[in-house]
């Protein structure tokens, strides 16, 4: 608000007023009269820049008159009262109401005093974020999508992630005239490491007190990545049972595990139990390559492990799952 003048009447009003599409807004406008100053106000006038005529007038004897009587109203001016408050209420804000307005006091003996106010017509956008479920492509693809619908002015969308990625943002007219829908895609080369990680879409808009943060949990579909654990190269005759585990990461989840050897089916000392393979005690040395084949909706992958059971004392050796 501009500071009051010294020794003269001054019109006080904010330089900019925000209002929401379809709502009502008050354009505040007051005449500041210093203590020792005397003034008489006979008319209050509101006009819009670039348009002919006044949109609203409050006349000392005729009262209020409006260019659109259903949409405008003097908030405080009354016949028979001192005209010091020219504040004007506008109903059913439209996009085309955005612009510069002049509030003017016709005073005596100071003359006309006016101020300009910029009315900003805003529309609060609705924001959504969703994952774009992808498969391994080897090329950058949209992995997340953030949409800010029906904003005025257009919302600003940014992405926050430690995975890298590039945004691709576009705009189209919103459903309501003068509004804009902003769509931002977050693009990255899909990898299994990205699956299940989060990225954040940040939407900023004049109508928000603070930015809106929307988190997206990424989904990458990929065939199984397989490894076998549980063997430490220290298996000896006479030891207790040991267990090998077929470790598989995949999306979607594995649908089946199949154990075999390079020679064909499992030997009698090896018993498959889903993702685990139970190795029973043996009485003679072994040198066998085991295969774990894992299947999911996208395909099958396998891992191999050569297992040796050697002669020697089993007492002090670790690395075997014992009963």
């Amino acid at each position: 608000w501009p500071p009051p003048g010294t020794g003269d009447v001054v019109v006080q009003a904010p330089t900019q007023v925000p209002g929401f599409l379809g709502d009502s807004v008050t354009l505040p406008c007051y005449l500041q009269v210093p203590n020792m100053e005397v003034t008489h106000v006979s008319q209050l006038t509101w006009a819009r820049h670039g348009e002919s005529g006044s949109m609203a007038v409050f006349h000392q004897t005729q009262g209020p008159s409006y260019s659109e009587s259903k949409r405008l109203e003097f908030v405080a001016a009354r016949l028979g009262a001192e005209l010091r408050n020219a504040s004007l209420r506008m109903f059913g804000l439209r996009v085309e109401d955005e612009g510069n307005y002049t509030c003017l006091f016709v005073t005596f003996p100071q003359g006309s005093r006016s101020v300009d106010i910029w009315l900003r017509v805003l529309a609060k956008p609705q924001n959504t974020a969703e994952v774009q479920k992808v498969q391994l492509t080897g090329e950058p693809v949209p992995m997340a999508r953030c949409v800010s619908t029906g904003g005025r002015p257009p919302a600003q969308i940014t992405w926050h992630s430690d995975l890298g990625g590039m945004p691709n943002t576009s705009q189209v007219p919103g459903f309501l005239s003068g509004t804009v829908t902003v769509t931002s895609l977050w693009i990255l080369v899909p990898s299994s490491q990205v699956d299940g990680k989060n990225v954040t879409c940040k939407v900023e808009h004049e109508s928000f007190e603070k930015p809106q943060l929307l988190t997206v949990n990424l989904t990458v579909y990929y065939p199984p990545e397989v490894s076998i654990s549980g063997y430490d190269n220290n298996w000896y005759l006479g030891q207790n049972e040991a267990t090998l585990t077929c470790d598989a990461r995949s999306n979607p989840e594995p649908t089946g595990y199949n154990w075999s050897t390079t020679m064909g089916p499992l030997p009698p000392f090896a018993v498959a139990q889903g993702a685990q393979l139970l190795i029973r005690p043996v009485d003679k040395p072994i040198n066998t390559t085991l295969i774990c084949n894992v299947t999911n909706a996208l395909g099958a992958r396998q891992a191999e492990l050569t297992v040796q059971v050697k002669e020697g004392p089993p007492s002090e050796h670790s690395g075997i799952s014992r009963n």
């Epitope: 006979s42 005529g53 006044s54 006349h59 005729q62 003017l104 016709v106 003359g111 006309s112």
Partner: antibody, heavy 116, light 107 residues
């Protein structure tokens, strides 16, 4: 009913002064500024100045500054306009008019003739 | 001072005619313009304030328009009783100034 009743015609010699009165009724005198406008015969209107009865604050047309004095008597709801150092070109009908930004009520006019 | 230039200075029209009088300000006066009607031997009568708003009691055949520097008074259907002189006036800044008048005669 709002009424502004002015004093009668005046014939004055050049160099003299004239004081025209305007008695008001039908409204609250102190709530409206009173102005004076003149009209030479067959010519246009010329604003002279005005006064706010409550404060006594005045505004004058620079063309008349120093020669014109506008006053009020709140007790009788009357406004006065005094013009001094009269010249022949001051011959005109003088109107008082209630100010509402524009002038919504006018007196009937007072003819002031300046002639030697 | 702001000059108010009125045109035409005189015109003659028939009953039922549409009549337009214009007034041009030498600088921007916003919408702070009034129009007056003055019949012979009478004081002026206020018709329009703030460029386009009619005083109560003024017939709706009288209308005003404009803002900035160009203003118009229109009589949509001239009546015999509209024989008069018409003046525009600006009250944007002191000194208040009037147009020189348009004398309207009935044919």
């Amino acid at each position: 009913e709002v009424q502004l009743v002015q004093s009668g015609s005046e014939l004055k010699k050049p160099g003299a002064s004239v004081k025209v009165s305007c008695k008001t009724s039908g409204y609250t005198f102190t709530e409206y500024t009173m102005h004076w406008v003149r009209q030479p015969h067959g010519k246009g209107l010329e604003w002279i100045g005005g006064i706010h009865p409550n404060s006594g604050g005045t505004s004058y047309n620079q063309r008349f500054k120093g020669r014109v004095t506008i006053t009020v008597d709140k007790s009788t709801s009357t406004a006065y306009m005094e013009l001094s150092s009269l010249r022949s070109e001051d011959t005109a009908v003088y109107y008082c008019a209630r100010w509402t930004g524009d002038f919504d009520y006018w007196g009937q006019g007072t003819l002031v003739t300046v002639s030697s | 001072d702001i000059q108010m230039t009125q045109s035409p200075s005189a015109m003659s029209a028939s009953v039922g005619d549409r009549v337009t009088i214009t007034c041009k300000a030498s600088q921007n006066v916003g919408t702070n313009v009034a129009w007056y009607q003055q019949k012979p031997g009478q004081p002026p009568k206020a018709l329009i304030y703030s460029a386009s708003y009619r005083y109560s009691g003024v017939p709706d055949r009288f209308s005003g328009s404009g803002s900035g520097t160009d203003f118009t008074l229109t009589i949509s259907s001239l009546q015999a009783e509209d024989l008069a002189e018409y003046f525009c006036q600006q009250y944007q800044s002191y000194p208040y100034t009037f147009g020189q008048g348009t004398k309207l005669e009935i044919k």
